[in-house]
Interface confidence: low
């Protein structure tokens, strides 16, 4: 169980990292990102990077560009695998980044966030099946 | 409880039509993809079609194809198939079932059944 | 559409035996298979998924192993309320397909 457990802590390290600039999305480069919506079962992990791959963009304006390129450094970084993210299912072919309908920073970060609760809710769901991850 | 209850079946003529519904409990529907199986009497599984989450993939087998129609309704919690041109072959018990989520393979939750009888 | 073959197709056998079920794939399917058991007028119950991954909740008498072209799904020691039919499944591609089932009879 260590590989899951490990992956749980990433997920919801991310969902912090998100709230966290959340904060600060008046500082964010007003531009208007990819920000994949009601995702498709199975393709989890193809909107996962479709987010990671986003230009977000901090505005260089005053105190908060470090604590703001940090955060968003934090959030490119590759999560621990899994069965589940190693093998997407190949039998489907998920729409790629730029078939998503692009919002701005606000909106973009706040899809991000349902992402993450959707994954970490679908993790526990088959962690309680008896799913065997690592 | 997690639960999945069919309805809709009964008896019908060849050529006559059929809507079976499912519906879905104590799980996050709008997650999930699901699936039709059937069961002719005395015969093996068959699965007839699949639809993801958001009804974006849909998948039937030759058999059903251009006959039957699957649909789900997520704020409903309801899964539907709509089955023309009803043939005698078709005669089977209909499964609704929950295909397990996130690159895991199975289908981990199935209802009751419901019979479909096509016969003149 | 790719074709599951389950063998035997009928097997007698007693309280306390092992007893192993094949699964071979008419081409590879990686691990994505499962294996369900059915009894009369039941609907079927999963047992195994990601083709060696034992369901929660399923006695660990039961085990599941393979990848590519062939399983196998084992009972260590069957008991009374193991005897019934079982199938394996793919989703490797669609159609899903379904093997024809392996009927346990007690002998």
């Known amino acids: 169980m260590q590989g899951q457990d490990r992956h749980m802590i990433r997920m919801r390290q991310l969902i912090d990292i998100v709230d966290q600039l959340k904060n600060y999305v008046n500082d964010l480069v007003p531009e208007f990102l990819p920000a994949p919506e009601d995702v498709e079962t199975n393709c989890e992990w193809s909107a996962f990077s479709c987010f990671q791959k986003a230009q977000l963009k901090s505005a260089n304006t005053g105190n908060n560009e470090r604590i703001i390129n940090v955060s968003i450094k934090k959030l490119k970084r590759k999560p621990p695998s899994t069965n589940a993210g190693r093998r997407q299912k190949h039998r489907l072919t998920c729409p790629s980044c730029d078939s998503y309908e692009k919002k701005p920073p606000k909106e973009f970060l706040e899809r991000f966030k349902s992402l993450l609760q959707k994954m970490i809710h679908q993790h526990l769901s088959s962690r309680t099946h008896g799913s065997e991850d690592s | 409880e997690v639960q999945l209850v069919e309805s809709g079946g009964g008896l019908v003529k060849p050529g006559g039509s059929l809507r079976l519904s499912c519906a879905a409990s104590?799980?996050?529907?709008?997650?999930?993809?699901m699936n039709w199986v059937r069961q002719a009497p005395g015969k093996g599984l068959e699965w007839v079609s699949s639809?993801?989450?958001?009804?974006?993939?849909?998948h039937y087998a030759d058999s059903v194809r251009g006959r039957f129609t699957i649909s789900r309704d997520n704020a409903k919690n309801s899964l539907y198939l709509q089955m023309n041109s009803l043939r005698a072959e078709d005669t089977a018990v209909y499964y609704c079932?929950?295909?397990?989520?996130?690159?895991?393979?199975?289908?981990?939750?199935w209802g009751q059944g419901t019979t479909v009888t096509v016969s003149s | 559409a790719i074709q599951l073959t389950q063998s035997p197709s009928s097997l007698s056998a007693s309280v306390g035996d092992r007893v192993t079920i094949t699964c071979r794939a008419s081409?590879?399917?990686?691990?994505?298979l499962a294996w369900y058991q059915q009894k009369p007028g039941k609907a079927p119950k999963i047992l195994i998924h990601?083709?060696?991954s034992l369901e929660s909740g399923v006695p660990s008498r039961f085990s599941g192993s393979g990848s590519g072209t062939d399983f196998t799904l084992t009972i260590s020691s069957l008991q009374p309320e193991d005897f019934a039919t079982y199938y394996c499944?793919?989703?490797?591609?669609?159609?899903?397909?379904f093997g024809q089932g392996t009927k346990l009879e007690i002998k």
């Open positions: 499944q793919q989703f490797n591609s669609y159609p899903y397909t």
């Open positions: 990601d083709a060696s």
């Open positions: 639809i993801t989450s958001g009804s974006y993939y849909i």
């Open positions: 081409q590879d399917i990686d691990s994505a």
């Open positions: 104590g799980f996050i529907f709008s997650s999930y993809s």
């Open positions: 079932v929950r295909e397990r989520g996130w690159g895991y393979y199975g289908m981990d939750v």
